[in-house]
């Protein structure tokens, strides 16, 4: 709130802008007839120093010259970089109560001369873009510093533009707004940047370049692809480019891929043939351009073209399996299953499957199409049957896959030996076996088949299977394997016209069952007791049950109970025991055991046998 210098003036020597480390003399002078009334000798001039509007020092002790009551000179040293405000005030010493009156003020800026600008680089984006140059200004000067960018070319012209740096903005880039023309492609241009402030000036070294050095072409645009004769593997990529482009780089990849296919194309003129595409695959295509074969810069990548290649007829063969069930003495139900082709084999959207069942000798043929991956038919039990399946998309069908329908477990001599199932981790099971001992025909392949042992799984869920070559004796099964679930696993050995199988149960992880079996009835027959139960609900089994235990003891007895251990069979739900005394009341219960341990006991039932006991 200074009434601007009404009472006097403040001057700075050598200047209000000084280099770092220099001293300055500040003189404060009162105008004629200003000062303390009646007592000029009582005029006392004081100098206050402010940084960021905060009073930091009273320079009373820095007076170097004094004309009593008229002017004073103060020396200031050790000023920090940036701006410092000095305010001269008049203190009338005979009036202690009045505060000092502001006379005038001055700002002193401390800084450094600019360093020569370095690392100049210039770019023109596209043939019709404008030249923009950037540089490194060096150390901050703490002063307003003007920068002039000057560009001299081959046509006797010099272009220049200015900007400045201060404590609010930084100037290290300028767009000249000038467009260099391609007809000057080989010509040399010289650019330099000059920096000037109150403490000095400096100039960069001249930086020389050609049109080709600095022009970055615009990325190609209007990208499209034309598939020759609707081919899924060959296509012509087309795009628009700036006129001077001589080199293109193409990159393309399937959308789910992590690595690009790269192609360099010279003088492509906006067209390139690709021959190695995968049919019915989502691809991403991008293109970059360059104006010179050896020099210059690549453009940014174009926007992506995303498109799907056309379909081609399926290749590969379907993996088929089947189940046979006798319905009555002369009919059987055949259920065929097959796995979907993987995308590289399907080469399109599979519209349907062509299924054929053929009786070899009578030449009876059943044919159908289905959109599902299974098919069931009832056929006579007589005759030798063969099945074939092929997959069809909009472009055609795959070669049919044939399988002979044999009695899968009909030949005991073909049954694999020593089948075992070991849990490997949470979601897979290692199945191992030994080959059949006395097979009268060679094993052509093994099939490992598995399904969850849950109610209705045979009808509700298709089987899972793996084809194993005849010289392998193990399989790691993982598809649809979940922990705490028991699976029935069959290993089939197939020859040309026969099959043998062995079965085992297995799980990938197990716990003790949640509960024991529920005893539903105890009946007495011919001096034996029959215990009947219901199996533990499937979710509570928590793995493969190895055996059940039936416990009994006399009511109110504190002795250890007796027990009978029964090998678990899914079909069995009753068991006789014969060591109970007649006319003694017993308490009975059951538990179930997995590889992880025994369940809590199931319900308790009391029973008093009536007949003679052995």
């Amino acid at each position: 709130n200074i009434d601007v210098c009404k009472l006097g003036t403040v001057t700075v020597q050598p200047a209000p802008v000084i280099p770092l480390g220099s001293a300055a003399n500040i003189s404060c002078s009162l105008n004629p007839k200003q000062g303390c009334s009646h007592y000029p000798s009582s005029n006392e001039l004081i100098l206050l120093k402010f940084v960021n509007d905060v009073l930091v020092e009273n320079l009373h002790g820095k007076k170097v010259h004094d004309h009593t009551g008229h002017s004073s000179t103060f020396q200031v040293t050790n000023l920090s970089l940036g701006m410092t405000l000095f305010v001269c005030k008049l203190n009338c010493s005979n009036s202690q109560k009045k505060p000092p009156v502001p006379v005038c003020g001055v700002e002193i800026s401390v800084g450094v001369a600019p360093e020569p600008p370095q690392n100049i680089s210039c770019v023109q984006e596209g043939e019709n873009g404008t030249v923009a140059c950037s540089w490194n200004s060096g150390k901050v000067t703490y002063l307003k510093t003007n920068y002039t960018l000057q560009l001299s070319g081959p046509n006797n012209l010099t272009c220049q533009k200015q900007c400045f740096s201060d404590n609010r903005q930084n100037c290290n880039r300028l767009d000249l707004g000038i467009n260099l023309s391609p007809d000057l492609a080989e010509s040399r241009f010289i650019v330099r940047v000059t920096a000037i402030n109150d403490l000095g000036n400096s100039s960069s070294l001249p930086h020389t370049f050609t049109f080709l050095d600095i022009v970055i072409p615009l990325p190609p645009w209007d990208i499209r692809i034309n598939f020759l004769n609707a081919s899924g593997s060959r296509g012509t990529l087309q795009w628009e480019d700036e006129g001077q482009v001589v080199l293109n780089q193409l990159r393309y990849q399937p959308l789910n891929s992590t690595s690009w296919n790269m192609v360099n194309a010279t003088n492509a003129k906006g067209k390139y043939d690709l021959r190695d595409l995968r049919p019915f695959t989502e691809y991403e295509f991008q293109i970059s351009s360059k104006l010179h074969l050896s020099g210059g810069s690549w453009s940014n990548w174009s926007e992506s073209l995303r498109t799907r290649t056309p379909e081609e007829e399926p290749v590969g063969i379907l993996d088929i399996w089947y189940m046979k069930q006798d319905i009555d003495y002369d009919r059987q139900q055949i259920s065929l299953f097959w796995k979907s082709l993987n995308p590289s084999e399907a080469r399109g959207k599979i519209l349907h499957y062509q299924v054929t069942l053929q009786e070899v000798t009578k030449k009876t043929t059943l044919q159908n199409t289905t959109r599902h991956t299974s098919w069931t038919r009832v056929i006579p039990r007589t005759g030798a049957w063969t099945a074939s399946v092929s997959a069809a998309n909009s472009k055609g069908a795959s070669a049919p896959t044939h399988i002979n329908i044999v009695d899968l477990c009909g030949t005991g001599l073909l049954a694999p030996h020593q089948v075992s199932a070991k849990s490997e981790n949470m979601d897979n099971i290692l199945v191992t076996w030994q080959p059949p001992k006395k097979a009268d025909s060679a094993v052509r392949e093994y099939i490992v088949e598995w399904r969850a042992l849950q109610p209705g799984s045979i009808t509700k869920f298709p089987p899972h299977w793996l084809r194993i070559p005849p010289d392998n004796m193990s399989a790691l099964i993982s598809e649809n394997i979940k922990p705490y679930i028991c699976y029935e696993i069959r290993v089939h050995a197939l020859s040309e016209s026969q099959g043998g199988c062995s079965s085992i149960r297995g799980d990938s992880k197990h716990k003790a069952p949640v509960s024991g079996p529920h005893i539903t009835a105890i009946t007495e027959k011919k001096e034996r007791l029959f215990i009947s139960w219901t199996h533990i609900p499937f979710p509570e089994q928590r793995g493969c049950i190895l055996h059940y235990r039936i416990y009994w003891k006399e009511r109110d007895s504190t002795a250890q109970p007796e027990l009978c251990e029964i090998q678990y069979r899914r079909s069995q739900n009753s068991h006789p025991i014969s060591s109970l005394q007649p006319r003694v009341t017993y308490v009975l219960w059951m538990t179930a055991v997995t590889a992880a341990g025994e369940s809590p006991q199931g319900n308790e039932r009391e029973f008093c046998p009536q007949g003679k006991a052995n």
């Epitope: 404008t130 070319g153 046509n155 006797n156 012209l157 272009c159 220049q160 533009k161 200015q162 767009d175 000249l176 707004g177 000038i178 467009n179 260099l180 023309s181 007809d183 000057l184």
Partner: nanobody
Framework: QVQLQESGGGLVQAGGSLRLSCAAS????????MGWFRQTPGKEREFVAA???????VYANSVKDRFTISRDNAKNTFYLQMHSLKLEDTAVYYC?????????????????????WGQGTQVTVSS
């Protein structure tokens, strides 16, 4: 109708200074490139300096570091400050206005790219 009017020419001694002005009327030229050309008898018009609408200054190498072009958009006026004048700077000086504000480097120096012209002002440098 668009008019450009030059002023400030005259007789000056070698080494002296002059400031030419170009006042535009009929349309604003704040988004245009403005140029100064000069012509001596029997010769084609020669490019002297131009200022683009983004304030880039363009100079013929023969006047670089001696002449300064500037603009005052509020007054729709353009200036050419000339220092260290030489005998060969004697000519009629013309102010020219560009319709589009083109940025191609070869455009600034070509008189055919400027559709608007003033009547000219004589500058004579004597020894």
């Amino acid at each position: 109708q668009v008019q450009l009017q030059e002023s400030g020419g005259g007789l000056v001694q070698a080494g002296g200074s002059l400031r030419l002005s170009c006042a535009a009327s009929g349309r604003t030229f704040s988004k245009s490139t403005m140029g100064w050309f000069r012509q001596t008898p029997g010769k084609e018009r020669e490019f002297v300096a131009a200022i683009t609408w983004t304030d880039t200054e363009v100079y013929a190498n023969s006047v670089k570091d001696r002449f300064t072009i500037s603009r005052d958009n509020a007054k729709n006026t353009f200036y050419l400050q000339m220092h260290s004048l030489k005998l060969e700077d004697t000519a009629v000086y013309y102010c020219a206005g560009d319709r589009y504000g083109s940025s191609r480097d070869s455009v600034f120096s070509s008189p055919t790219n400027y559709p608007y012209w003033g009547q000219g002002t004589q500058v004579t440098v004597s020894s």
